[in-house]
């Protein structure tokens, strides 16, 4: 799996989308988990509704929400009020029994708010991640 980079601004919301094959993953619940390091374990943050037919209903854990378009094959995760500590590796997963298939590996990057003048002299202009030569960046 390549890693897709999603960049958001501190204090704002960031929407992460994970496309998948709706037929292959028919009937499966989905989850969003946080990975501790590039090779670390993935800790569940939030999962879709217990009843697969109700996967379109938004489920929330703290500032993270998840909803699944099971027909269109798109899992959407929203991180509200993005903070520096939200940065890191995540995975979108498709669940079956006690197993989980990775739909997408995601690196969330948190950019300083350009309107926050506390750091005006030290603004970071995002560049291509040195760790992911083939990473796909989405804003």
């Amino acid at each position: 799996h390549n890693t897709t980079v999603f960049q958001g601004v501190e204090g704002q919301s960031l929407q992460v989308s994970c496309p998948y094959d709706s037929m292959k993953h028919w009937g499966r619940r989905k989850a969003w988990c946080r990975q501790l390091g590039e090779k670390g374990p993935c800790q569940r943050v939030v999962s879709t509704h217990n009843l697969w037919l109700l996967s379109f209903l938004r489920r929330r854990n703290g500032s993270t929400a998840i909803t699944d378009d099971t027909l269109g094959g798109t899992l959407t995760i929203t991180l509200r009020n993005l903070q520096p500590h939200d940065a890191g590796f995540y995975q979108c997963q498709s669940l079956h029994g006690s197993e989980a298939d990775t739909l997408r590996k995601v690196l969330v990057e948190v950019l300083a708010d350009p309107l926050d003048h506390r750091d005006a002299g030290d603004l970071w202009v995002p560049g291509e991640s040195e760790s992911f030569e083939d990473a796909h960046v989405e804003h």
Partner: antibody, heavy 120, light 107 residues
Framework: QVQLVQSGAEVKKPGASVKVSCKAS????????IHWVRQAPGQGLEWMGW????????KYAPKFQGRVTITADTSTSTAYMELSSLRSEDTAVYYC?????????????WGQGTLVTVSS | DIQMTQSPSSLSASVGDRVTITCHAS??????LSWYQQKPGKAPKLLIY???NLHTGVPSRFSGSGSGTDFTLTISSLQPEDFATYYC?????????FGQGTKVEIK
Amino acid sequence: QVQLVQSGAEVKKPGASVKVSCKASGFSIEDFYIHWVRQAPGQGLEWMGWIDPENGESKYAPKFQGRVTITADTSTSTAYMELSSLRSEDTAVYYCHADHGNYGSTMDYWGQGTLVTVSS
Amino acid sequence: DIQMTQSPSSLSASVGDRVTITCHASQHINVWLSWYQQKPGKAPKLLIYKASNLHTGVPSRFSGSGSGTDFTLTISSLQPEDFATYYCQQGQTYPRTFGQGTKVEIK
């Protein structure tokens, strides 16, 4: 018990090469990145490079590029660091270090260190 | 390469003192900073990862804060076993880089 055990101290002549080993026990090295860090006498820590034993991919600090080779043998759970064209300023303690990589690894294991002395 | 600058390079303190060490990164590194403690003749030990997360088994008197380019390690009440050298290390990009170290000595 999770640990990294390194090979013993070495004394080398300038221009020679040294190969230090680091054997993991209690965990599988494929699940980690293995880094090499050195520390000259009375100095700070200096990162040299890493290997992903799962696929053999390695990355080196520009300062050591071309002079250092990091390898791993998953069958024996051992990583190796070879430094060539040794000079006196390479005299240092060399540590191997295992973690889950960048971006917030919670795992962190270190070897006991191997003293390499370069002297004519 | 990202340069990491620690200050002070050394400090003298007494048992019970509150000690603060700072680390400045030459580029934005978000929260990808670790703090290590090293005692003479020993390998470094991880104290803090991801700028503010306490590693397993590390006493709660240690804390970390900061994001972006400026970070702080605080020891709320210095204990005899805390006299050591402390290093920050950035874990955002390779090559990983360490600060030059801060030696905490007994006053």
